[in-house]
Each structure stands twice: as structure tokens, then as C-alpha cells.
């Protein structure tokens, strides 16, 4: 009896959909695996007789529920199928946006770049897919614990009237208000303000 794959899960970030599993202990030899997806009542092979423990399902539609399954094989024997269901538009992880930060005197000027849909070669982004897409920004004085959050209206934001000659750190994430779903935070970017531009009277 061939044991089934273990810990079967979907690892999906920005619609790069990778089904992953672990090979079970099997004394007779090395196992291979076949992974399939359900397409209009029929299961279609995606990865056949692979020695890998993952399979790329990124070509699946972003919309609707998909049934995926994987089994282990040895010679002419095979395990039972292990099934999972997956809805990319609901389940994919929203990766961190890009961010450009520029210091102008006592202000930080930020521009945000929505993460690209990973499995495509054009410039579609996660913002295209999700109508309610917005950004959350958090910033803080470097070395302090207090963080401030804002929700920019656009793909850019300016933090004004900051303390001069002070290092501020900023990070951004995508947020979907209609789904109450937050993406991953970008790595903090820390920049030092310069002088206060106000002219003394």
C-alpha cells in the first residue's frame, strides 16, 4: 500500500499558485507524484510522475473555486488522492507593494507600486484585480515604538511637518476594505528629514 502525500497545502502569493506537499515515508523506494485539477467535471493532469513535491497551478482562473488533488505512486501502485479546494481571488496572499521614498526638507514623499500578478508577463497588478484596493501606510520615528497609520487616497502620499533632522521609517501594505483583507507589509524604508523649511519671522 502506497501512503498518500502529507501536509498538502496551497502556497499562493499574488496568484502564483504552488501546490506543495511532503513525501511520506516509504521503504520500497522513491515515490513519484501526480497532481491534477478539476476542469468541467474531468480531472486534468498538471504534473505527472514528478519527483518534485510541488506543482504550479498558476494558470488556473483567479475566479471561482478549484478542486486540486495529488497522489503518490510507486511502480504500478498508487495512494489515495488527497484533495484540496482553492479560490485564488479569496485565498491568495497579497504580497508587499513597492515603495519609493524621497525626503524634501521636513517632508517624506512616498509613491506606492501595487504588486505584480506573478504569473503574467505584462503589467497587470493586484490593484487591477481588486476593485476596492487601497494602501495602508504606517510610519514611526526610528527607535520608538509608537506607530501612526494612514490610508492614502491615491498611489502617493506626503508626510508633512515632520521633526527636522529625524529618521522616520515607513512601510506600506495593500488592503481590501470590502473583504477586510490585508496584504503583507513592505520592508521598512528609513530616511532622515533635513531642515524645517519655514522661514523665521
Amino acid at each position: 500500500m502506497v501512503p498518500p502525500p502529507e501536509n498538502v497545502r496551497m502556497n499562493s502569493v499574488n496568484f502564483k499558485n504552488i501546490l506543495q506537499w511532503e513525501s511520506p515515508a516509504f521503504a520500497k523506494g522513491n515515490l513519484t507524484f501526480t497532481a491534477q485539477y478539476l476542469s468541467y467535471r474531468i480531472f486534468q493532469d498538471k504534473c505527472m510522475n514528478t519527483t518534485l513535491t510541488e506543482c504550479d497551478f498558476s494558470s488556473l482562473s483567479k475566479y471561482g473555486d478549484h478542486t486540486l488533488r495529488v497522489r503518490a505512486e510507486f511502480a504500478d501502485e498508487h495512494s489515495d488522492w488527497v484533495n484540496i479546494t482553492f479560490c485564488p481571488v479569496d485565498d491568495t496572499i497579497i504580497g508587499p507593494p513597492g515603495m519609493q521614498v524621497e525626503v524634501l526638507a521636513d517632508s517624506l514623499h512616498m509613491r506606492f507600486l501595487a504588486p505584480k500578478i506573478e504569473n503574467e508577463y505584462e503589467t497587470w497588478t493586484m490593484k487591477n484585480v481588486y476593485n476596492s484596493w487601497t494602501y495602508n501606510v504606517q510610519y514611526w520615528k526610528n527607535g520608538t515604538d509608537e506607530k501612526f497609520q494612514i490610508t492614502p487616497q491615491y498611489d502617493f502620499e506626503v508626510l508633512r511637518n515632520l521633526e527636522p533632522w529625524t529618521t522616520y521609517c515607513v512601510q506600506v501594505r495593500g488592503f481590501l476594505p470590502d473583504r477586510n483583507k490585508a496584504g503583507e507589509w513592505s520592508e521598512p524604508v528609513c530616511e532622515q528629514t533635513t531642515h524645517d523649511e519655514t522661514v523665521p519671522s
Epitope: Y37, L38, S39, Y40, Q44, S58, S59, L60, S61, K62, Y63, G64, H66, I117, N119, E120, Y121, E122, W124, N128, V129
Partner: nanobody, 126 residues
Framework: QVQLQESGGGSVQAGGSLRLSCAAS????????MGWFRQAPGKEREGVAT???????NYADSVKGRFTISKDNAKNTLYLQMNSLKPEDTGMYYC????????????????????WGQGTQVTVSS
């Protein structure tokens, strides 16, 4: 909400031609992958022709040289020109769309398209 509406089906003699159209609302054809699928009675739905946002096309072997897929982005309409029709081309023809898709992966199965029209019937008699 994306909506697709096919038209242009009908009955034709073998060797004849038909042109199917698929009009979209809530979606722009320039932003994704489109396809024509068909389903004969008692059979599974199968891919006939697909077109990516960059205009690149793919055809099922059974229709190569006879069918042509195209799109008019300005009219937001997808077409399937079917020439030299055969009785085995008979079936319900469906238009399918997958928004924000560029063809980074070849898409050829039902599960790879998220939105579907209601279909238009094509009948080819000998």
C-alpha cells in the same frame, strides 16, 4: 460584473461558413485572455481557439487552417470566423474570458477561464 453574450450561431451545410461574435460588458478585451470553447451533445467542453491580450493565438488541431479567432478592442468584441465547416463542428459554442491575464501560461481548459457566456448553437449538416 463581467458579462459575455455570444451571437452568430445557426445551421449551415458542410463546407459553409459562420462568424460568431462575443460582446463583453464590465470588461475590456485588451486586459486579458479570451477563448472559444465548444460542447457537442454528450461530450465534454473543449477548447477551440484562444487569444491573449497581446494578440497571440492558439488553435485546436481539429480547426487549424479553418477557424480564425480575432478581437476588436474598440468594439469590445471577440470573433470566431469558421470556414469549411464539418458535421463534427456541431455543438454549443461558448465565449470565455480571464481578466488580467497576458498569456504568461498557455490556457486551454475550462478551469483556466473565469467568465463564460451562455453559448450559441452551431449545427452543421452533411
Amino acid at each position: 460584473q463581467v458579462q459575455l453574450q455570444e451571437s452568430g450561431g445557426g445551421s449551415v451545410q458542410a463546407g459553409g461558413s459562420l462568424r460568431l461574435s462575443c460582446a463583453a460588458s464590465g470588461y475590456t478585451y485588451s486586459s486579458g485572455c479570451m477563448g472559444w470553447f465548444r460542447q457537442a451533445p454528450g461530450k465534454e467542453r473543449e477548447g477551440v481557439a484562444t487569444i491573449n491580450s497581446d494578440g497571440s493565438t492558439n488553435y485546436a488541431d481539429s480547426v487549424k487552417g479553418r477557424f480564425t479567432i480575432s478581437k476588436d478592442n474598440a468594439k469590445n468584441t471577440l470573433y470566431l470566423q469558421m470556414n469549411s465547416l464539418k458535421p463534427e463542428d456541431t455543438g454549443m459554442y461558448y465565449c470565455a474570458a480571464e481578466p488580467y491575464c497576458s498569456g504568461g501560461y498557455p490556457r486551454w481548459s475550462v478551469a483556466e477561464f473565469g467568465y463564460w457566456g451562455q453559448g450559441t448553437q452551431v449545427t452543421v449538416s452533411s
